[in-house]
């Protein structure tokens, strides 16, 4: 099986994680999407999800997590504001497609939050000051509970150009192309 790739983000307490999950295909635009944390020895836990169907450019806030789905560019924007050390961990975006199991979007995010505010963050840090203004039109969505007896499985790497490097725009048209992730709330 191919190795799951991770993108590492090192941020300070109080800063903002701002990542984009790339889902590429139009058929996923309206699908409900979720942000999950993966803790060692546990199933992925859904922390926040978009509405169902997912609305275009409509912020959904769950606590300090804000999701925005940009259908026209195939991007799910995930922001975790006012980061705390305990937010450190491994995260992923998934697309819900009931009754099928969710599709995981590459890459997983390895978040490392350290103590102490860094002052003025670098422009490449995607971070903000401690005070964060939440967009005025946020909505909280209910996330579905998916259970599955299956374990995480992976297909071998594709040899076609449908998998581009390095940011892997993956052809998800065939169920063997994707990683199946059982999801528990």
């Amino acid at each position: 099986a191919t190795k799951l790739t991770e993108e590492k983000y090192e941020l300070k307490e109080g800063q903002t994680l701002d990542v984009k999950c790339d889902y590429t295909l139009e058929k996923f635009a309206s699908s409900q999407k979720a942000w999950q944390i993966i803790r060692d020895g546990e199933m992925p836990k859904t922390l926040a999800c978009t509405e169902r169907p997912s609305k275009n450019s409509h912020p959904v806030q769950v606590g300090r997590i804000i999701l925005e789905d940009y259908h026209d560019h195939g991007l799910l924007r995930v922001r975790m504001v006012n980061l705390q050390v305990e937010d450190s961990g491994l995260y992923q975006c998934v697309i819900y497609q009931p009754p099928k199991e969710p599709h995981m979007l590459f890459d997983r995010i390895r978040l490392v939050v350290t103590k102490g505010f860094s002052g003025t963050p670098g422009s490449n840090e995607n971070s903000t000051q401690n005070v964060y203004k939440i967009p005025p039109t946020t909505t909280k969505a209910l996330c579905p509970l998916y259970t599955s007896p299956r374990t995480v499985t992976q297909a071998p790497p594709k040899s076609t150009a449908d998998v581009s490097t390095p940011d892997s725009e993956i052809n998800l048209t065939n169920v063997t192309d994707i990683i199946r992730v059982p999801v528990f709330n």
């Epitope: 590429t24 295909l25 058929k27 026209d72 560019h73 195939g74 725009e169 052809n171």
Partner: antibody, heavy 121, light 111 residues
Amino acid sequence: EVQLVESGGGLVQPGGSLKLSCAASGFTFSTYAMHWVRQASGKGLEWVGRIRTKSSNYATYYAASVKGRFTISRDDSKNTAYLQMNSLKTEDTAVYYCTRDMGIRRQFAYWGQGTLVTVSS
Amino acid sequence: DIVLTQSPDSLAVSLGERATINCRASQSVDTFDYSFLHWYQQKPGQPPKLLIYRASNLESGVPDRFSGSGSGTDFTLTISSLQAEDVAVYYCQQSNEDPYTFGQGTKLEIK
């Protein structure tokens, strides 16, 4: 292997019509937007337009130079995209390429070999 | 419409030397920190071939002497060590907004 094969090109008089076809194979056709790009002899590439998927209600978008004269359509059951060209002008003379992107607003990873359309009296 | 302007229009470079082609957009082609700007190579009688996607990502199978950089409105395609088979016309293209547009092309030759 992804393959795109254009057909339907030829000689047509100004004001006439022509319909180009793009037969696709090697991928799930219905999943991807399809585009047409043209190139006049010795000139650069010009994007003609695109048609999105059923998920996006087969929305179409066109370059200003062809809007109102050209229509892009698709038949997912036949794995084929079409370019209907009406009110043709001499400046429409070009090689017409069918292309497939890698997803929403993504790059053109696959191209056909092209079909030549000549508009002349 | 977003206008892409390439410079130079033509370029002659010695074998083994570096070749640089620029592409400037009339407005930003970025959405968040993603640049929807791609580079293609076209040889006579052939369809274009994708080299670089989203500004800096090397397409599978393309030699690593090709690289792309830039964001917003200014982008660069670099060939680190020109080979004879690199003689071609190079195009930038944006897909951030409809209508999609191409640059006018840069013809690369051997000096």
